[in-house]
Structures are given as structure tokens and as C-alpha cells.
């Protein structure tokens, strides 16, 4: 069967979708690309928490699956020939988006190694029992199905969308209903937050009587990193309610009129936003919630605030506090790099000295210079270092074969050389197109 | 490729109104913002709004606000800019700009130029 | 509103030598993303003005790279390194950070 039921959670940059269907992980993991995402990454706790509550809102929607013991396919998988790397969290698996190693990892089991052929993992969710944020689903690895042969309890797929950004979801201050379209073709009426280029379609009235007014919006990028719908203040508005429904759709504080009318405020310290419904802190940056040497940059508009550190430091994961950074990872020397505390060094070898074109260059010392050659007669300087040569009936000598000494001529001959919706996927991309359009046969325009 | 082609010049009386269209092709209308700037005789560039036309949402400088009306048509891929209470210091040449994902105003009309003398 | 002042109001440079515009803004333009939204553009007279400098310093599609931009979070210059007779306009720093939108007052180049 295909891929059924399915659930949405949007978080951070993020969303996860959850299906019911007996798919091969390839099947699967097209149906996830087919939309312009990928099977899901599980790269934290917190991710898999995420991971979790999709495939708890699946549970509650899905009326009876087959097994007690349940398998759905996330995003990891070892190509054959590749083989356990027992050592690494990862066992050797990737991600199919492509993206680095991860720390995290929770198997289910010791894994077998078989390098024969392809492996693929799932999820492994135990229906008999709840599901708690503390007892998240174990990794399963086995066998990748093929098409009408999933693999045995398979049923179903997390899929994972990234999003450039996210807005709120949008404000009714009366009765009325949302419905989201997202750029992966799920709509959903409840989102807690609500993907760059997704539709919203507003219909205002109680619903069993004629609506009184219906409004579309999109959500885009209003300014950098400022994503938000367009609309101005509540929507649905009814002066029957006032402030009494929803807060009158208001953020903080509700400020009703003698004649029904209302207006959105905010409490002392926060401002109201141009949406006329969203309270946003006059200064983030007030409480200081940056450490050691981090700096706080307010915001476009004052709406948030990140951390910023000095030249030679970065963020640690907490994006609150500064580490530093090893510049020497990026190889900015020619030859030896020594990372210092917000900075780096570079050295040259035995033979070299600093100089050259270009930053942290080095170049050959010239040990042959005059008044500088350690050679008793000649002297040929070479690439980071020299040798010696003597002249006729003389052969090199001593230790270091710096000296010459006379040949004894009745003894006889002595005798180295890569040249604006959009989703995204690891290495790729996958462009899309606002509800409407259609993505054209090259794969990048919208028609 | 990219093209905004902008409606004819226009001469207009003090107080009353004008509506320059931009028509766009080459790319996908709804999915960009298109910003109006509009230049005076011998004078800088100034941003006065722009408009959506995926959803109709739009922004106004505040300078101009209750003057400027922008509207967008999806079926035809033409954005309209209307400008109202038309006085001589509204004689310029009017631009339609496409705004691109690094926020850049990458693609401009050939200006339309409104002249405003009674 | 951010509010910009371009200098010079003209310049003239003779052929081959290098051009200075300097611009300054009223507030930073640094984003907390680490991008400065600031973005040079060229108006040749009787022609709409062309992109020229995205972001501060990345370079526009077909612009010549004597073409730079730098600068920090107010503070902004884009250079030309060698002036050709082609390069003749008037340039414009503008700002895409918050709205309204803001452009400078132009610079004129001229050959010396």
C-alpha cells in the first residue's frame, strides 16, 4: 500500500511529518524527496523528542496497526560493501541528506556485521507502551525491503523538511478557521509554527452560519530573517465577543472599546510589533544573556538578539558563550599551524624560514649563502635543505658528509622527485514552487 | 529572462491621480517582491513601497502612506502603482524593482516619467 | 528610518587610477545572521540604476571584479581599482536591513 495517515510537528527550522504505509525505505525515502525533503535525521535528544511527538500524533490518528512491535524508517542507512565501524556512533551508517557525523545514537542492539548488503534503519516503537519523552524510540537496523516487501513490522516513515525560517501561527481574534498548506503538500489546521512559503486560508464566521469574510496570506521573508504572514491585526474580529475570544487574538494584552472594538498591548518592557497583535522585548539584550567575552547584537527592529564573538572565537552549542576557534583546521599554513587562545601560528620546517607570497608562507632557507654554507668546497642549495660536493679527487666525508677528503687513487674507483521556494536537501537541492505554481520539467523555474 | 516592462509616460494636473502598470515575465511573479522607487530631475533614489503579489501583502513609506496604492495582478503578472493627490514635487521617473533573495533590487523597469504641472 | 551619507557628492579620478565612495550609515547594518545588508548600485544618465555590490562584497552577476566592496557595521566603501571611461555614473549605497528601504545621496564620477 502506499504512504497513508499522516501527521506534521514544526519546530525551529523544521518539519516532521509522520506516515502510515508498508514502504521499502527507498519508497519511502522518494515519497519524502517527491515533496523536497528527506527520511529524517535524528542527530539529538532533542530531535528525536521531535521525532517522537510526529509519531505519537500519528498514533493517536491511526485506528489499529498490525504489530505491537513497530517499525518506521528514518533517514540512516550503510550502502553495501560499506561495512560496521563499530567505533563511531554511527556504526558506519550516514544520513541520506548527507551532513556530518553525530554524537548522538540509540540503539536498540549490538549490531551484526554484515557488509553484503544494504542496511537501513527504523525506529522501533513499542505500542504496548506509552510514549515518553524519557523512553525515546530505540534504532533498528535490518534488512532495506523492496517494493510490496518492506520488511517485517514496517509501518510507516518519518519524513523531515527544512525551512529557510518560520512564522507565528496566525492570530483570530473571533470564531473562524485557519487552514495551512505547507510546501510539502500537508494541511493542517494547528501547526505551532508555520514554514517559510506555506499558504493560510482564513474563513471568519461561526461555520454553520454564512461566513462573513475569508483572507489568504503566504508566509514570507518581510524583511532578513523576519518572517511573518502580512496581516494586520486579529483576524476575525467580531464585536459579539470583544476580547473574550482568544484574548481577542492578541499576544499579551486585550484593551476593548465601549463600542466592541479592541485593541492588541503589550505589558511594561515589551513593545507591540507591526502586526498589531505580537509583543516583542523593547531590548533582548537588556538581561545580558550572553557570557565570557560574547557580545549581544540586537535584532532588525529589536526583535531578537544573537550572541557575537571576537575575532578568533565562536559559539559554543549553547549560542550563548564563546570557544575558540581552531583555526588550523582550515589549513592557513604552508607547512606547520600552531592554534592559539583567539588566533593561530604558523611555523616553518627544518630548512624553511617565514616568507613568500601569501599569508603564513614559507621559504627555502638558502644554506649555501655566502659566509652561511656549512659545506668544506661546494655547496648546492635544494628544496628546504643542501648538499654538499667536492672537487676532483676528493670525495665527501665526515658524519654529516660536509667534509671532502683526498681519494686514494691506487685503491681504485670508490667507488625526489568548483561557478531565489526553496528546499532544502544535503548536496543538493530541491527547488519548489508557492501553491499554484507548478515546478517546470528543468527542475529550477515555476510555471 | 527577467523583465519588467513599465506603462508610458504620463502628464498630470496638481490633485489629481496616476496609475503606472510594470508588467513582469521570465521568472515567478508571485514568488518576489516588487518594490516602487521613484527619482526626481536630477535627484537620488527614494523607496516608496512595495508589494507581494503571491498574497496582495504590501508596505508603504510612511512618507507617502494614504497616497500610494500598489495592487498586483497574478493572471496577467502586471503590478500596479497608483499615486493620488498628485502635486509638482511628485514629478518624477517612476521604477518597478524586483527585490531577490539576497534582498538586492536586481532587475529595474525602464522608468515611467510622471509629469505633474497645472 | 536608517538614515545614510554618501561621500563625495562628485569625484573625479583620471583613467587607470583607483576610486573611493565612502558611505555611513545612521545604524548598523550587520545583521544578527553575520550579513550586512548593504548593496551598491550604478546609474549611467538616461538608464535605470544597475546592481552592482550585494551584501556588502560579493560582486553581481557580469560586473568587472575592479569592482570591491567592504566596509563594517556603518561604515562602507566600494572601490574601483583601475577607473575605465565605461565607469562613468552616479553611484548609489542603499540599505535592505529594515524598512523603508534607504538609498545615499549619489556619488558623480567623473574622468579627470
Known amino acids: 500500500t502506499g504512504a497513508d495517515t499522516e501527521a506534521v510537528v514544526c519546530v525551529g527550522t523544521a518539519c516532521y511529518t509522520a506516515h502510515s504505509g508498508k514502504l521499502s525505505a527507498a519508497e519511502a525515502q522518494n515519497h519524502c524527496n517527491q515533496n523536497g525533503g528527506n527520511l529524517a535525521t535524528v542527530k539529538s535528544k532533542e530531535e528525536a523528542q521531535h521525532v517522537q511527538r510526529v509519531l505519537a500524533q500519528l498514533l493517536r490518528r491511526e485506528a489499529a496497526l498490525t504489530a505491537r512491535m513497530s517499525k518506521f524508517w528514518i533517514g540512516l542507512q550503510r550502502e553495501k560493501g560499506k561495512c560496521l565501524d563499530p567505533s563511531l556512533p554511527l556504526k558506519g551508517f550516514s544520513w541520506v541528506g548527507g551532513g556530518e557525523d553525530t554524537p548522538y545514537s540509540n540503539w536498540h542492539k549490538e549490531l551484526r556485521n554484515s557488509c553484503i548488503s544494504k542496511r537501513c534503519v527504523s525506529l522501533l516503537l513499542d505500542l504496548s507502551q506509552p510514549l515518553l519523552p524519557s523512553r525515546l524510540p530505540k534504532w533498528s537496523e535490518g534488512p532495506c525491503g523492496s517494493p510490496g516487501s518492506p520488511g517485517s513490522n514496517i509501518e510507516g516513515f518519518v519524513c523531515k523538511f527544512s525551512f529557510k525560517g518560520m512564522c507565528r501561527p496566525l492570530a483570530l481574534g473571533g470564531p473562524g478557521q485557519v487552514t495551512y498548506t505547507t510546501p510539502f503538500q500537508t494541511t493542517s489546521s494547528s501547526l505551532e509554527a508555520v514554514p517559510f512559503a506555506s499558504a493560510a486560508n482564513v474563513a471568519c464566521g461561526e461555520g454553520d452560519k454564512d461566513e462573513t469574510q475569508s483572507h489568504y496570506f503566504l508566509c514570507k521573508e518581510k524583511a532578513p530573517d523576519v518572517f511573518d504572514w502580512g496581516s494586520s491585526g486579529p483576524l476575525c474580529v467580531s464585536p459579539k465577543y470583544g476580547c473574550n475570544f482568544n484574548n481577542g487574538g492578541c499576544h499579551q494584552d486585550c484593551f476593548e472599546g465601549g463600542d466592541g472594538s479592541f485593541l492588541c498591548g503589550c505589558r511594561p518592557g515589551f513593545r507591540l510589533l507591526d502586526d498589531l497583535v505580537t509583543c516583542a522585548s523593547r531590548n533582548p539584550c537588556s538581561s545580558s544573556p550572553c557570557r565570557g567575552g560574547a557580545t549581544c547584537v540586537l535584532g532588525p527592529h529589536g526583535k531578537n538578539y544573537t550572541c557575537r564573538c571576537p575575532q578568533g572565537y565562536q559559539l559554543d552549542s549553547s549560542q550563548l558563550d564563546c570557544v575558540d576557534v581552531d583555526e588550523c583546521q582550515d589549513s592557513p599554513c604552508a607547512q606547520e599551524c600552531v592554534n592559539t587562545p583567539g588566533g593561530f601560528r604558523c611555523e616553518c620546517w627544518v630548512g624553511y624560514e617565514p616568507g613568500g607570497p601569501g599569508e603564513g608562507a614559507c621559504q627555502d632557507v638558502d644554506e649555501c649563502a655566502l659566509g652561511r654554507s656549512p659545506c668544506a668546497q661546494g655547496c648546492t642549495n635544494t628544496d628546504g635543505s643542501f648538499h654538499c660536493s667536492c672537487e676532483e679527487g676528493y670525495v665527501l666525508a665526515g658524519e654529516d658528509g660536509t667534509q671532502c677528503q683526498d681519494v686514494d687513487e691506487c685503491v681504485g674507483p670508490g667507488g625526489p622527485l568548483c561557478d531565489s521556494l526553496c528546499f532544502n536537501t544535503q548536496g543538493s537541492f530541491h527547488c519548489g514552487c508557492l501553491p499554484g505554481w507548478v515546478l517546470a520539467p528543468n527542475g529550477v523555474s515555476c510555471t | 529572462q527577467v523583465q519588467l516592462v513599465q506603462s508610458g509616460a504620463e502628464v498630470k494636473k496638481p490633485g489629481s491621480s496616476v496609475k503606472v502598470s510594470c508588467k513582469a515575465s521570465?521568472?515567478?511573479?508571485?514568488?518576489?517582491?516588487l518594490n516602487w522607487v521613484r527619482q526626481a530631475p536630477g535627484q537620488g533614489l527614494e523607496w516608496f513601497g512595495r508589494?507581494?503579489?503571491?498574497?496582495?501583502?504590501?508596505d508603504y513609506n510612511g512618507k507617502f502612506k494614504g497616497r500610494v496604492t500598489l495592487t498586483a495582478d497574478k493572471s496577467t503578472s502586471t503590478a500596479y502603482m497608483e499615486l493620488s493627490s498628485l502635486r509638482s514635487e511628485d514629478t518624477a521617473v517612476y521604477f518597478c524593482?524586483?527585490?531577490?533573495?539576497?534582498?538586492?533590487?536586481?532587475?529595474w523597469g525602464q522608468g515611467t516619467t510622471v509629469t505633474v504641472s497645472s | 528610518d536608517i538614515v545614510m551619507t554618501q561621500s563625495p557628492d562628485s569625484l573625479a579620478v583620471s583613467l587607470g587610477e583607483r576610486a573611493t565612495i565612502n558611505c555611513r550609515f545612521s545604524?548598523?547594518?550587520?545583521?544578527?545572521?553575520?550579513?550586512?545588508?548593504l548593496y551598491w548600485y550604478q546609474q549611467k544618465p538616461g538608464q535605470p540604476p544597475k546592481l552592482l555590490i550585494y551584501?556588502?562584497?560579493n560582486l553581481a552577476s557580469g560586473v568587472p571584479d575592479r569592482f570591491s566592496g567592504s566596509g563594517s557595521g556603518t561604515d562602507f566603501t566600494l572601490t574601483i581599482s583601475s577607473l575605465q571611461a565605461e565607469d562613468v555614473a552616479v553611484y548609489y549605497c542603499?540599505?535592505?536591513?529594515?524598512?523603508?528601504?534607504?538609498f545615499g545621496g549619489g556619488t558623480k564620477l567623473e574622468i579627470k
Open positions: 521570465g521568472y515567478a511573479f508571485s514568488s518576489y517582491w
Open positions: 524593482v524586483r527585490g531577490d533573495g539576497y534582498w538586492a533590487m536586481d532587475y
Open positions: 551584501q556588502m562584497s
Open positions: 542603499a540599505q535592505n536591513l529594515e524598512l523603508p528601504w534607504t
Open positions: 508589494i507581494y503579489p503571491g498574497d496582495g501583502d504590501t
Open positions: 545604524k548598523s547594518l550587520l545583521h544578527s545572521n553575520g550579513i550586512t545588508y
